[in-house]
Structures are given as C-alpha cells and as structure tokens.
C-alpha cells in the first residue's frame, strides 16, 4: 500500500502552501525506501536516494515555480510514481448569511472570504437551540446536527425546511480543502431573518366617476404558505408621474382606494409586505403598476368591489376640505386572506 496519505482532491495531486516547506511523497514505494526525484521532462536530479529523506522530497519555501509534476524513481530505476504539486492556502471561514421568505423554511448562502486556489467543498449542517431552564437566558445547542441540504448544480446555498418560527438555529458551514477545514457558525432566528417576497398581481384601476380616485389591489406572494398561521401587513406607495416623492399608506387588507390622486395624471403604485407582528423586515417593493384616474361620470351600477353613494364625486376647491378617506375594513374571516377582502367605502 502507498505510504502517501491521499488528501481530499483529485488522485495524484499533493498540496502545499506558498512560502512554506512542502513535502512530496512517492506513492509507489514502501515507506522509507530511498528514491530519486526529477521534474517531469527535465533530466536534472532534484534529490538523490542518499538524501536520507527516504521516499519524500522536501521543497523549502515553495513558490509558484515549484508547481507542476514530479517523478520519483527507485534505486533500480523503476518508476515509483508521478506527483503533481499544487500550491494554495488553507481555508478561511466562509461568509454566511441566511434569509427566510416565509415562516416555515429558511435558506443560507455562503461565499469564501478568501480564495484558497485549491479544490474546495462545503459541509453544511444545523442544530436547533433551546433555552436552558424556564428563566434562563442561556441557550445551548441541543438537537441535531442535521444536514442542511445543498442546492444541486453547485449553488452555494442550503435550505432548512420545516423550521420552527420561535426557535433559534445554529448554522455550521465548513469550508474544506486539502490543507484543512475552517468553520463559520451563525446563530439565526426565523423571526429576525424573515423577509417576505413582495406582493404579487398588483393592479391599479380607475374608479369611474371619481377623478381623484384609484383602486389598487394585490395578492399575497406565492411563497407565503397557503394555510397561514401568520398574516402579512402591507405598505403601499403612490405618486403621480414626474413627481419625485412617494405618498405612503398602510392598507388594512389586499386593496386600497387612493382618494387624493391628481386628476388626469398617470400614477405609479407599488406595494411591500411584512409579517403582521413586525417580525423581520419589509419585503422589497413590488414592480410598479400604473393607473390613471377616470375622467367620466359615475356608472349607474354600484361597483362590484364595494358600495359607493351614487352621486358624482365633487372635486374639493382649494379652500374646502377633501372628502374623507374611505374606511377599508378587512373581512371578518381575517385568517383566510385568500378570499377577496370586502371593502366598504361610504362617502359622507
């Protein structure tokens, strides 16, 4: 059997660090057997069998010129083997961050904080942490570790499914190369890393007969669980075209009636989501949707989405108060947000 321990990586390759002493091992001989060493394709003897180093070649202060293929021969001239030297660095701790788009799963991504120049792989696992004692603030890893399954195709990402919203987790990402391993531990709680995807299906429609109104509607992001234990709240911004500043409102449901739109101008609208108990952070903004208030008169039918008194809207004069903002109350069945939220708008 070979006297050379096989480092992780391709066969026949041995590894060292620039600026350090490197030992190469002749794979096809018995440990301690004297051998001669040559660079592949060069006749010059690098180290003879009388060096006292047996089956090893020592390169002091290795640098990039030492990289390449070496040949070792036994005393009778037989080929002891070929060895390729590759120089690089031991792993540094990877940089790890975790994020959650819902309250049941989270993913962690990583990047090397320093490129080693060597074949590298990552080991990913996690533990669930629990509080020690009812009144204790101390936490200790208690269950696991379990593997954090990595994405196929080499993406630097792993996903924890079926996480508990109120638990804390310790993520372990270990960078491994032939010169060693280095581990980054990251403590995460789902509550702090929760960031929903932006709401979907944003639509902006005019309200016939109301030249200062726009109705915006949207849906929950598809990534939010279908049977929710936790709701989302929303933030809506709108502005007329060419106007730099956004107006912001927090709608009560999945619709909002804007009552102070600028007549005749297109308006940009966007919406963001957050856990309704303020866990984590607001989502990114949805793509903007555009709408222009109507210029016609009110139709004879009451709009299907709500009830409005049927007199046409009177635009307020400069010195008269604006009409009150419609009251938008969510449907009593608050937890089933997949139903359309019933909007009731009553003008005084």
């Amino acid at each position: 059997s070979s006297p050379c321990p096989q480092a992780w990586g391709p066969p026949g390759v041995q590894y060292g660090q620039p600026g350090r002493s490197v030992k190469l091992c002749c794979p096809g001989v018995t440990a301690g057997d004297p051998v001669s060493w040559f660079r592949d394709g060069e006749p010059k003897l690098l180290q003879g069998p009388d060096s006292g180093l047996g089956h090893e070649l020592v390169l002091a202060q290795a640098d990039s010129t030492d990289e390449g293929t070496y040949i070792c021969q036994t005393l009778d001239g037989a080929l002891g083997g070929t060895v390729t030297l590759q120089l690089g660095y031991p792993p540094a701790r990877p940089v790890v961050s975790c994020q959650a788009a819902d309250y049941e799963n989270f993913s962690c991504t990583w990047s090397p904080s320093q490129i080693s120049g060597l074949p590298t792989r990552y080991l990913t696992s996690y533990r669930k942490k629990t509080v020690l004692g009812a009144d204790s603030q101390r936490r200790s890893p208690s269950t696991g570790p379990w593997p954090c399954p990595q994405d196929p195709l080499g993406a630097a990402r792993c996903v924890v499914h079926g996480a508990e919203f109120w638990s804390q987790y310790r993520i372990n990402v270990t960078e491994v190369n032939p010169l060693g391993a280095s581990t980054r531990l990251l403590d995460v709680s789902l509550q702090s890393i929760l960031r929903p995807d932006p709401p979907q299906g944003l639509r902006v429609e005019s309200v016939p007969g109301y030249p200062r109104r726009l109705r915006a509607s949207w849906t929950y992001p598809a990534s939010w669980p279908c049977q929710p234990h936790f709701l989302l709240k929303f933030r809506l911004q709108y502005r007329p075209a060419q106007h730099p500043a956004w107006s912001t409102v927090e709608p009560a449901g999945l619709e909002e009636v804007i009552t102070d739109a600028v007549a005749g101008l297109p308006h940009a609208v966007r919406v963001s989501a957050r856990d309704f108990l303020d866990a984590g952070t607001w989502s990114t903004w949805s793509p903007e949707a555009w709408g222009t208030p109507s210029t016609g008169t009110i139709p004879k039918e009451i709009p299907a989405w709500g009830q409005l008194h049927t007199q046409p809207e009177v635009e307020p004069q400069v010195d008269s108060p604006a009409p009150p903002r419609p009251s938008l109350q969510p449907h009593p069945r608050l937890l089933d947000h997949r139903d359309s939220v019933e909007q009731v708008a009553v003008l005084a």
Partner: antibody, heavy 118, light 107 residues
C-alpha cells in the same frame, strides 16, 4: 510591492455624495475579501464595510447601512465605497484594508480624509 | 454587535518596563482577537492575530494571550519606538469591532 492606495476623499456638504477608490497591487486582489475602516479625528477605529472576493456578499456597519455601498472591480484591482447622504459624523480618515478570514486586517492603505461640513 | 472594552485607556511607562493591556469582549469570541499598533498619522499595523500569534516581522517583545472573553497584550520591554495607540479587535462574527484603544507613552 504589496500595497493599497486610497483616493477620492475631500470636502463635501451634508447630504452630499462621494466615491472612494482603493487601488491594490502586489497581490492577487481577486482572491481576497476587502474592507473599509474609518477613524474620526482623535477617535478610535470603526469598521465600515466588507465585501467577499466575488462581490456576492457584503456587510455594513449599522451606522452606514442604506447610505454606503461597497463594490469592487477585480479586473481593475480596485475597491470602491459609494457614500451618499453624508453626515457630519461621517468625517473621518477612511482606510482600505485587506483581511484574511474576513476580519483579520494584515494590510492597510494610508487612508484618505473625508470631511463633511457646510 | 459585540462590544470591546480596553484598559487602561492610557499609560506611561519607562523604557525597559513590562507593559500590559487588557481587552474584554461582551460575549465569547473564541480566540478571534487581534492587536494593532497605530502611530500618529499612520495606518494601523497588525501585531498579534488569533489572540496569541505573532505577525511575521513583528519583534518578539510583543505577545498576546487569552480566549473566550478576556485577553491580554504584553510588551515585555518597552522601547521608545513603541509609543503608539494599541487596539484590540474581534472578528468572531461578520461585523468586526475594535476596542477604544490604549495610548502608550514614555515617562
């Protein structure tokens, strides 16, 4: 010679913007994370931001989050810090540093002074 | 963020004296602690990394010890060129933090 050279500092009004650059030489820039550290006049050192070799992960101090953006161009061996909405408390010498393992700063530039004042 | 405290904030000592600076972290940082020297108008210079390892080219009179939350930096025999401010710095997490510094001068 292994070195880092910052540029782009100067006097700017509150609310203004500035872009700092750090030119690296003498080492394989694209292999290393890079960092900005600042030091207000007469004060201690404060880590500002770091970026991994690929640029895919960035990290910011809370005091600059949302206002500063770190980036890099590995083809030009250059690190950048885009500073927006500058405040008086951002006045400092800004150092570019090369860390090993993200936070072990073995190489520093000479620094560039940023003064935020009206 | 992890808070770092240093003591004393300043000290005066004679040439040849043994000088000791302590650094405390607000939570366990393993041995992810570095020490830097900064002379007036100059950039910081790494002296000790990972609590106790001497950076290449740094004189052996500088040393460090400790792990967890409590760390010590020592100059075994103070030299005139050691007049500077010394900072400890943790990098256990992704937001490195520095201690407030200890200013060392000669009596």
């Amino acid at each position: 010679e292994v070195q880092l050279l910052e540029s782009g500092g100067g006097l700017v009004q509150p609310g203004g913007s500035l872009r700092l650059s750090c030119a690296a030489s003498g080492f394989t820039f694209s292999w290393y994370s890079m960092t900005w550290v600042r030091q207000a006049p007469g004060k201690g050192l404060e880590w500002v931001s770091s970026i991994v070799p690929s640029g895919g992960h960035t990290q910011y101090a809370d005091s600059v989050k949302g206002r500063f953006t770190i980036s890099r161009d590995n083809s030009k061996n250059t690190l950048y810090l885009q500073m927006n909405s500058l405040r008086a408390e951002d006045t400092a010498v800004y150092y570019c540093a090369k860390p090993l393992d993200w936070g072990l700063f073995d190489l520093w530039g000479r620094g560039t002074l940023v003064t935020v004042s009206s | 963020d992890i808070q770092m405290t240093q003591s004393p904030s300043s000290l005066s000592a004679s040439v040849g004296d043994r000088v000791t600076i302590t650094c405390q972290a607000s939570q366990d940082i393993n041995n992810y602690l570095n020490w830097y020297q900064q002379k007036p108008g100059k950039a910081p210079k790494l002296l000790i990394y990972d609590a106790s390892n001497l950076q290449t080219g740094v004189p052996s009179r500088f040393s460090g010890s400790g792990s967890g939350t409590d760390f010590t930096f020592t100059i075994s025999s103070l030299q005139p060129e050691d007049i500077a401010t010394y900072y400890c710095q943790q990098y256990d997490n992704l937001s490195p933090t520095f201690g407030p510094g200890t200013k060392v001068d000669i009596k």
